[in-house]
Interface confidence: low
Amino acid sequence: GVSFFFLSFHISNLQFNSSLEDPSTDYYQELQRDISEMFLQIYKQGGFLGLSNIKFRPGSVVVQLTLAFREGTINVHDVETQFNQYKTEAASRYNLTISDVSVSDVPFPFSAQS
């Protein structure tokens, strides 16, 4: 089976603008690509299956997304711990200042995104 986790965090050194509401814009696509790449770096273990439903909200930039793992390979605490451990690396590698990290279980992957 598959376990899903809903993750939300702030990128405090980026500014939200209307182009982050439109997936066709360069800014949206670049930020989406860089965040996807970052998560592949963070969760390198075999259980990570990928992420989906990236959304951007105002508040500098608030990022919301769903992470998928093989069932039983990771729990909420470990998802949050690994992400928090990566924050300084995110600053250096991706020029992202991350704060206000929140992780929760998602019983059905996309219900939390509606």
Partner: antibody, heavy 123, light 111 residues
């Protein structure tokens, strides 16, 4: 003062392994990546890979994957690069370098380098 | 892999002249507005020395005659007035994608 001090020159036979050390001082060792770069005689610079000492996370250049291993000893602030199955083309100067930030923490680059370790592979 | 191409291979100038070194990436090295390109100077028998980071930021202690410019794929290192001690090989490095890659280098000589 940030310093990276590498071990001395090595002469090895083809097929052997070599282990080069890089001792760091003058900064917080754990949160900074250490890069490994080599330079063959008269040639340019080639990135081999990196290790983050605090977690042991590594990234390798695919060209060297399977032949190179990076390890870190946080008790002595030392990083090691071991290259196996040596061939004559591995004759080079091997550098370790810190991927560090400026005083404001705003920018990152490979800023401090070791003095280099010459590895000669010859039968 | 991102291929970094430097030109010219050799630059021979008189003291006081302006040196312009080029580095071209095979794909963009920009990430969220930051260009992950760095310039190094290497003199014979020495380790490389960081001159410019993130395309245009002068490393502490480096003379102001060195400057960097460019974005995404095309970058330039400029030495505004060449000094004899600037004789060296200059390398660009991209840290945007693993494996990190260096350009082949530009050798700067004094005429």
């Amino acid at each position: 003062e940030v310093q990276l001090v590498q071990s001395g020159a090595e002469v090895k036979k083809p097929g052997a392994s070599v282990k080069v050390s890089c001792k760091a001082s003058g900064y917080r060792f754990i949160p900074y990546w250490i890069e490994w770069v080599r330079q063959a005689p008269g040639q340019g610079l080639e990135w081999m890979g990196e290790i983050l000492p605090g977690t042991g996370r590594t990234n390798y250049n695919e060209k060297f994957k399977g032949r190179v291993t990076f390890t870190a000893d946080t008790s002595t602030n030392t990083v090691y690069m071991e290259l196996s199955s040596l061939r004559s083309e591995d004759t080079a100067v091997y550098y370790c370098a810190r991927y560090g930030d400026d005083t404001s923490g705003g920018y990152y680059a490979v800023d401090y380098w070791g003095q280099g370790t010459t590895v000669t592979v010859s039968s | 892999d991102i291929v970094m191409t430097q030109s010219p291979a050799t630059l021979s100038l008189s003291p006081g002249e302006r040196a312009t070194l080029s580095c071209r990436a095979s794909e963009s090295v920009n990430i969220l507005g930051t260009n992950l390109i760095h310039w190094y100077q290497q003199k014979p028998g020495q380790a490389p020395k960081l001159l410019i980071y993130h395309a245009s930021n002068l490393e502490t202690g480096i003379p102001a005659r060195f400057s960097g410019s460019g974005s995404r794929t095309d970058f330039t290192l400029t030495i505004s007035s060449l000094e004899p001690e600037d004789v060296a090989v200059y390398y660009c490095l991209q840290s945007r994608k693993i494996p990190w890659t260096f350009g082949g280098g530009t050798k700067v000589e004094i005429k």
